[in-house]
């Protein structure tokens, strides 16, 4: 679970009383609103490891919409546009964290979630293993 | 704010009493423990769009450690090692969800907040505008 | 605990058709997992039949198994199929369902199988 | 369709010996290929994958070398547990409509 740091002037959560449960706001701040968007952008489609995205949906989560990545080639992509499979283009991927209703289909009772999730894909030299 | 399917066996959450919290369970359940953790290992030393990865901590958040990647390079690895300025190796981002201690130091009370992370790098062809 | 358990097995009549099911349990299909196919005839070697992307729901086969062999998958019930059409005699086997062994986004299951269910029989004799 | 063609396809060695089984492809695969072992009456169990990388678990008597169409794995001493039958697999794929993962026929290693 999490590290919860005491603090006087808060109820104890250390109490054998005290929930595993804590209160979350759902108006979500959003601290990027400001910042220049230029993101991932078309960047799926200009790298040397190319990918897709796919819809993950999933009404008991929140987020329910999840973009994953997926890598075109096992290689990587020359600049006469060839794939070059001496090279591996693999995903990069993150754990983030969901929302998860629980129990099932209520609105107001969530429990926290880490999944992995693939974010986009780069190219990488192999690993070769050498034979003593 | 998320959007909340109505479910007859749940509170009512459309009460104008009901508050604009839900009840989060801390105990996080990870979907991929299970799985075989190949992740982005080291991805980050191999890739032709080599990245650090810089972490940024701050206890009023969950989680309170989010590793943030930072491209080494504005060009890219060739084998050879040197590298390539025709080409561009750029952080690939993602918004994610985390939760905001509210009021802050209270340890069971958080807003949930969207930041944009910078998870890792990727080997792009440069945009080249040409003047008419 | 992470497994498969393979069922619809069994005795099929020379022109029928058959539906294995393979539930996995210990893991959840969300996201990309390569989920695979594979058969042994009676003393013979290893045959690959094909597998499907339970992320995007695509599906690579055998030139052999084209046509005749269709994988889907179920992610709610966290579960894969294989019907087979048009069974012949040379389709006896034990057939297994197997997990690609890198999980999420990789461009084809180019990993390996690291997961392997028990096996179902499937008899195809009139 | 690519085709895998292991060799021997049977061996007979004792326990300490050096093994060593062959595995070709028909055109190139480039480092896409895997080695599993199976005993009799069970599941095909995965030992190496990328030609060279050994799966968590299995005993560093085990590796893989190989590239292209010409691969090789190696059991450096042999013990008891590891007379069984042993398959490589090609991984590769060029496209959705290109796609193989062919088995070898196996090779089945014997107590001498």
């Known amino acids: 679970g999490i590290a919860i740091p005491r603090n006087s002037g808060c109820p104890n959560s250390e109490d054998k009383n005290f929930p595993r449960t804590v209160m979350v706001n759902l108006n979500i701040h959003n601290r990027n609103t400001s910042t220049n968007p230029k993101r991932s952008s078309d960047y799926y489609n200009r790298s040397t490891s190319p990918w897709n995205l796919h819809r993950n949906e999933d009404p008991e989560r929140y987020p329910s919409v999840i973009w994953e990545a997926k890598c075109r080639h096992l290689g990587c992509v020359k600049a006469d546009g060839n794939v070059d499979y001496h090279m591996n283009s693999v995903p990069i991927q993150q754990e983030i964290l969901v929302l998860r209703r629980e129990p099932r289909h209520c609105p107001n009772s969530f429990r926290l979630e880490k999944i992995l999730v693939s974010v986009g894909c780069t190219c990488v030299t192999p690993i070769v293993h050498h034979v003593a | 704010g998320i959007a909340i399917p109505r479910n007859s066996g749940c509170p009512n959450s459309e009460d104008k009493n009901f508050p604009r919290t839900v009840m989060v369970n801390l105990n996080i359940h990870n979907r991929n423990t299970s799985t075989n953790p190949k992740r982005s290992s080291d991805y980050y030393n191999r890739s032709t769009s080599p990245w650090n990865l810089h972490r940024n901590e701050d206890p009023e958040r969950y989680p309170s450690v989010i590793w943030e990647a930072k491209c080494r390079h504005l060009g890219c690895v060739k084998a050879d090692g040197n590298v390539d300025y025709h080409m561009n190796s750029v952080p690939i981002q993602q918004e994610i969800l985390v939760l905001r201690r509210e009021p802050r130091h209270c340890p069971n009370s958080f807003r949930l907040e969207k930041i944009l992370v910078s998870v890792g790098c990727t080997c792009v062809t440069p945009i080249v505008h040409h003047v008419a | 605990e992470v497994q498969l358990v393979e069922s619809g097995g069994g005795l099929v009549q020379p022109g029928g058709s058959l539906r294995l099911s393979c539930a996995a349990s210990?893991?959840?299909?969300?996201?990309?997992?390569?989920m695979c196919w594979v058969r042994q005839a009676p003393g013979k070697g290893l045959e690959w039949i094909g597998c499907i992307d339970t992320g995007d729901g695509t599906t690579y086969y055998a030139s052999w198994a084209k046509g005749r062999f269709t994988i889907s998958r179920d992610n709610s019930k966290n579960t894969v199929y294989l019907q087979m059409n048009s069974l012949r005699a040379e389709d006896t086997a034990v057939y297994y369902c197997a997990r690609d062994a890198a999980y999420g986004g990789y461009a084809y299951p180019a990993h390996g199988m690291d997961l392997w269910g028990q096996g179902t029989l499937v008899t195809v004799s009139s | 369709d690519i085709q895998m063609t292991q060799s021997p396809s049977s061996l007979s060695a004792s326990v300490g010996d050096r093994v060593t089984i062959t595995c070709q492809a028909s055109?190139?695969?480039?480092?896409?290929l895997s080695w599993y072992q199976q005993k009799p009456g069970k599941a095909p169990k995965l030992l190496i994958y990328?030609?060279?990388t050994l799966t968590s678990g299995v005993p560093s008597r085990f590796s893989g070398s190989g590239s292209g169409t010409d691969f090789t794995l190696t059991i450096s001493s042999l013990q008891p547990e590891d007379f069984a039958t042993y398959y490589c697999q090609s991984n590769f794929g060029t496209a959705s409509t290109t796609y193989y993962n062919t088995f070898g026929g196996g090779t089945k290693l014997t107590v001498l």
């Open positions: 990328l030609a060279s």
């Open positions: 210990g893991f959840s299909f969300s996201g990309f997992y390569y």
């Open positions: 055109e190139s695969i480039y480092r896409y």
